[in-house]
């Protein structure tokens, strides 16, 4: 089957309940063109910030062409949940679906999209829309990766040694320093899937007075700086 090459198309907006909402649908320029009898299986990896709302879309097929629309949801450590709509009888059916935050956007006969209200870490998983037509099935799958913004701290703990921590991020953050020092980085993994990254750096060079910790993460980057306390009795070089 032809495989459309998908690029991310994230739309973010503010809703009434002040939660950012992101919707990932097909980037229309990337659709494969020969779709006569192709049973298309399209999968997209999608990072979504925790505590936002997410909307997942089905392939662009009009309701008049459909027999059944099914959303299949596979979350870690849980039985597969399915939400199905049968057009002929106008009935919806759910199997093993316990999370009330995962729902149809509206009536499935009006909109086949699936929404996740207030995305949590537990929503990490695979979501697939299956559209059954008289001539075969069209699929649209999402590997949903929930992103958690780490809390960043920077402090000096010994002579000319600074510690930068990116606490409970998902995925793990990356820490870099300006200027570079003699650094050691450790990662601590938590049961909920988040990671704490701790970078400890030492600067022997006495003309380094201010250091910056730069934390890179999929949810955004953050920089903090700190003035290194001079070593007692050491001469501090003058800045140009």
């Amino acid at each position: 089957a032809a495989q459309p090459n998908n690029s991310l198309m994230l739309q973010t907006s503010k809703e009434n309940h002040a939660l950012a909402s992101s919707s990932l649908c097909m980037d229309e320029k990337q659709i494969t063109q020969n779709y006569s009898k192709v049973l298309a299986e399209v999968n997209t990896s999608w990072p979504v910030k925790m505590a936002t709302n997410a909307v997942l879309c089905c392939p662009p097929i009009a309701l008049r062409n459909l027999i059944i629309i099914t959303w299949e949801i596979i979350l870690r450590g849980q039985p597969s949940c399915t939400k199905a709509y049968k057009k002929e009888t106008n009935e919806t059916k759910e199997t093993n679906c316990t999370d009330e935050r995962i729902t149809w956007v509206s009536r499935p006969d009006q909109n086949s999209d699936l929404q996740i209200r207030t995305v949590a870490i537990t929503h990490d998983g695979y979501y697939r829309c299956i559209m059954v037509t008289p001539d075969g099935n069209f699929h649209r799958g999402y590997h949903l990766q929930v992103l958690v913004t780490p809390e960043v701290t920077l402090f000096q703990n010994r002579n000319r040694t600074a510690v930068c921590k990116a606490v409970a991020g998902k995925p793990a953050a990356h820490i870099s320093w300006i200027p570079e020092g003699d650094c050691a980085t450790k990662q601590e993994y938590w049961s909920n899937g988040t990671v704490t990254v701790k970078s400890t750096c030492h600067w022997e060079v006495h003309n380094v007075s201010t250091v910056t910790c730069h934390v890179s993460h999929l949810t955004g980057n953050k920089s903090l700086y700190i003035e290194l306390l001079p070593v007692p009795g050491a001469k501090k070089s003058a800045k140009l």
Epitope: C25, Y35, A62
Partner: antibody, heavy 119, light 110 residues
Framework: QVQLVQSGAEVKKPGASVKVSCKAS????????MHWVRQAPGQGLEWMGY????????NYNEKFKGRVTMTRDTSTSTVYMELSSLRSEDTAVYYC????????????WGQGTLVTVSS | DIVLTQSPASLAVSPGQRATITCRAS??????????MHWYQQKPGQPPKLLIY???NLESGVPARFSGSGSGTDFTLTINPVEANDTANYYC????????FGQGTKVEIK
């Protein structure tokens, strides 16, 4: 390959009915929605409605409701469009067009059937 | 009902130049991230031929001189560069549950 072949030209008197056929080949007939569109001389395209051969569902443009009937014969892979109570302004070329699933686009059209309504 | 308004009604373009046709919908034809707007070319005595689907996708076999853009209510068909055999009528179409065409744009090559 996918093909739609329509019936020949018709001349009808005002008040009469006309039934235009569209024979499909090269695909599973019952799997795809068929639309009907007409075009009066020198005018644009006007959607009349569709029939879904899979379940016999129809949906007509409000303008033609009560005058148009779309049917299908699965044994011959043919759809029909019948327009009744003809008037001179119904003189037009009538086209059938198959809707492709992806994007609801119409990739295959019949060659057109000229219907002339004249007393 | 959604009404589609095309402009201009006609235009004359020299070969090698760019032709731009716009189509405005009375309400959004975009849903779930897709714009259900298509463009067709019709030459005299022939049925329409699909050029662009879902606002910006080139139908198989159509020259890359044709391109489409837009979302929501405003859409554009561009022919660049125009060639002599592009003389035709061009129609935008909204196709989802109730289908509608724009009134057409006649393109003539000078």
């Amino acid at each position: 390959q996918v093909q739609l072949v329509q019936s020949g030209a018709e001349v009808k008197k005002p008040g009469a009915s006309v039934k235009v056929s569209c024979k499909a080949s090269g695909y599973t007939f019952t799997s795809y929605v068929m639309h009907w569109v007409r075009q009066a001389p020198g005018q644009g395209l006007e959607w009349m409605g569709y029939i879904n051969p899979y379940n016999d569902d129809t949906n007509y443009n409000e303008k033609f409701k009560g005058r148009v009937t779309m049917t299908r014969d699965t044994s011959t892979s043919t759809v029909y469009m019948e327009l009744s109570s003809l008037r001179s302004e119904d003189t037009a070329v009538y086209y059938c067009a198959r809707e492709d699933y992806y994007g609801s686009r119409w990739g295959t059209w019949g060659q057109g059937t000229l219907v002339t309504v004249s007393s | 009902d959604i009404v589609l308004t095309q402009s201009p009604a006609s235009l004359a373009v020299s070969p090698g130049q760019r032709a731009t046709i716009t189509c405005r919908a009375s309400k959004s034809v975009s849903t779930s991230g897709y714009s259900y707007m298509h463009w067709y070319q019709q030459k005299p005595g022939q049925p329409p031929k699909l050029l662009i689907y879902l606002a910006s996708n080139l139908e198989s076999g159509v020259p890359a001189r044709f391109s489409g853009s837009g979302s929501g209510t405003d859409f554009t068909l561009t022919i660049n560069p125009v060639e002599a055999n592009d003389t035709a009528n061009y129609y935008c179409q909204h196709s989802h549950e109730l289908d509608r065409f724009g009134q057409g744009t006649k393109v003539e090559i000078k």
